[in-house]
C-alpha cells in the first residue's frame, strides 16, 4: 500500500458561520516540514499555500475573503512533506450567513419557565425557505433543524436548567446559505436551588474550541510532532451537518 502521512486537522477560526462579504479563515494543521498545503472545496482543489520557511510551523491559515454562496460548502485539506502526501482531513462545512432576510424567533409558553415545563421555539421567515435552524449561543455546533413553509417549530420537551441560555434561529436557503440571524431569545429556566447552582454555565463566546492552534517548532516539538499529530487526530471529533 502507498505510504501516506497522518491526516491534517481542519478548523474554522472563530466560527464556521461567516456573514456574507466577510472573511473566513480556515486552518489546516499538518506537520512541521510540510512544503505545501492544499485546500479542497467540494472535492476540487481550491487554493494552495507554500509556507516559507516550511520547517518552522505545523500548519497554515487559508483566508477566504468576500464570503458568498459560491464559497460556502464542504472543505478539506491535505499537506505534503517532500514528495509524500498526507491523507485528506475530515470535512468542514463552511456556511455563509446574512443572506436575504431576518427570521423572527419566539418561544411558547414564554421566555421564563420552570424546570420540567414543555417549551417550543417558533422560527418564522416569510421568504421562500423550507428549512429552519435553531442554535444556542455558545453551542453553535449543536444545530437543530426543522421544516416548514414559513414557520417551523422546535419542541424542546420538558426543560431543565441546562436549557437556559440565548437562542437564535436562521432560515436556510440550502445547507450552506443561511439567512440573517433572528434577534436572540433568552430562555430562563428556574428550578430548585440545587439544580440552579449546579447548572452548567455556557461560554459567552461561540465555538471557543475552534481556534487555530498553529505552533512554531522547537527541538522538543520536532521529536514529538508526529506522535502529537496522530494523537490529536484520534481525539478530534469534527462537526458534520
Amino acid at each position: 500500500p502507498k505510504q501516506t502521512l497522518p491526516k491534517p486537522i481542519i478548523r474554522a477560526e472563530s466560527t464556521y458561520m461567516v456573514p456574507k462579504e466577510k472573511q473566513a479563515t480556515l486552518c489546516c494543521q499538518g506537520s512541521y516540514g510540510a512544503v505545501e498545503y492544499q485546500l479542497h472545496f467540494e472535492g476540487s482543489l481550491f487554493a494552495v499555500e507554500r509556507p516559507k520557511p516550511p520547517e518552522r510551523i505545523n500548519g497554515v491559515k487559508f483566508h477566504i475573503p468576500d464570503m458568498n454562496s459560491r464559497k460556502a460548502g464542504r472543505y478539506s485539506c491535505i499537506y505534503r512533506v517532500g514528495e509524500l502526501w498526507s491523507e485528506r482531513s475530515d470535512l468542514l462545512d463552511l456556511v455563509v450567513t446574512e443572506m436575504y432576510d431576518t427570521p423572527t424567533l419566539s418561544v411558547h409558553p414564554g421566555p421564563e419557565v420552570t424546570s420540567g415545563e414543555k417549551v417550543t421555539f417558533y422560527c418564522r421567515l416569510d421568504t421562500a425557505t423550507s428549512m429552519f435552524l435553531l442554535l444556542k449561543e455558545g453551542r453553535s455546533r449543536d444545530v437543530q433543524r426543522s421544516y416548514g413553509k414559513v414557520q417551523a417549530e422546535f419542541p424542546m420537551g420538558p426543560v431543565t436548567t441546562a436549557h437556559r441560555g440565548s437562542y437564535r434561529c436562521f432560515g436556510s436557503y440550502n445547507n450552506y446559505a443561511w439567512s440573517f440571524p433572528s434577534e436572540p431569545v433568552k430562555l430562563l429556566v428556574t428550578g430548585d436551588i440545587e439544580n440552579t447552582s449546579l447548572a452548567p454555565t455556557d461560554p459567552t463566546f461561540p465555538d471557543s474550541w475552534d481556534t487555530c492552534l498553529l505552533t512554531r517548532e522547537t527541538g522538543l516539538q520536532k521529536d514529538l510532532a508526529l506522535w502529537d499529530h496522530t494523537a490529536q487526530n484520534h481525539h478530534h471529533h469534527h462537526h458534520h451537518h
Epitope: 472573511q23 476540487s44 482543489l45 481550491f46 499555500e49 509556507p51 475573503p65 459560491r70
Partner: nanobody, 127 residues
C-alpha cells in the same frame, strides 16, 4: 471593482508559442491573486495556471506544466501567460481572473475563488 482585458490570442501552429496578456484596471492590483482558465467549445471552464499576489508561488494544471508560464508585473497591473509547445488540445477561449486574498502566498485554483473575470481571448492551434 477590477476590470480585466485579455489580449494576445490568435491562430498559431502546433509547436509554436503565444503570449497572452491580461491588463487590470482599478486599484490594488497587487492584492489580487490571478489565474488563467480556458474553455473549449462544449466543455467546462478549466483551470490553467495561477499566481499569488506577490508572484510566488505559482501553480499549473498538469496538462500545461513545463509548457506554460504565468507571471505578473504589479507595476504594470498586468499578468501574462507564456504558452510554448502548443498543441491542438490547447485550442480554447482563455479567460483571466482576479480574486482577493488576505495573504500574498496564496494561489487560488478554483473558479469560485475568483471575483472578477475578463471577456476572454480566442486561441486556435492548427496542426
Amino acid at each position: 471593482q477590477v476590470q480585466l482585458v485579455e489580449s494576445g490570442g490568435g491562430l498559431v501552429q502546433a509547436g509554436g508559442s503565444l503570449r497572452l496578456s491580461c491588463a487590470a484596471s482599478g486599484r490594488s492590483f497587487s492584492r489580487y491573486a490571478m489565474g488563467w482558465f480556458r474553455q473549449a467549445p462544449g466543455k467546462e471552464r478549466d483551470f490553467v495556471a495561477a499566481i499569488s499576489s506577490s508572484g510566488d508561488p505559482t501553480y499549473y494544471a498538469d496538462s500545461v506544466k513545463g509548457r506554460f508560464t504565468i507571471s505578473r508585473v504589479n507595476a504594470k497591473n498586468t499578468v501574462y501567460l507564456q504558452m510554448n509547445s502548443v498543441n491542438p488540445g490547447d485550442t480554447a477561449v482563455y479567460y483571466c481572473a482576479a480574486g482577493l486574498t488576505a495573504r500574498d502566498t496564496t494561489v487560488v485554483v478554483h473558479p469560485n475563488g475568483y471575483s472578477y473575470w475578463g471577456q476572454g481571448t480566442q486561441v486556435t492551434v492548427s496542426s
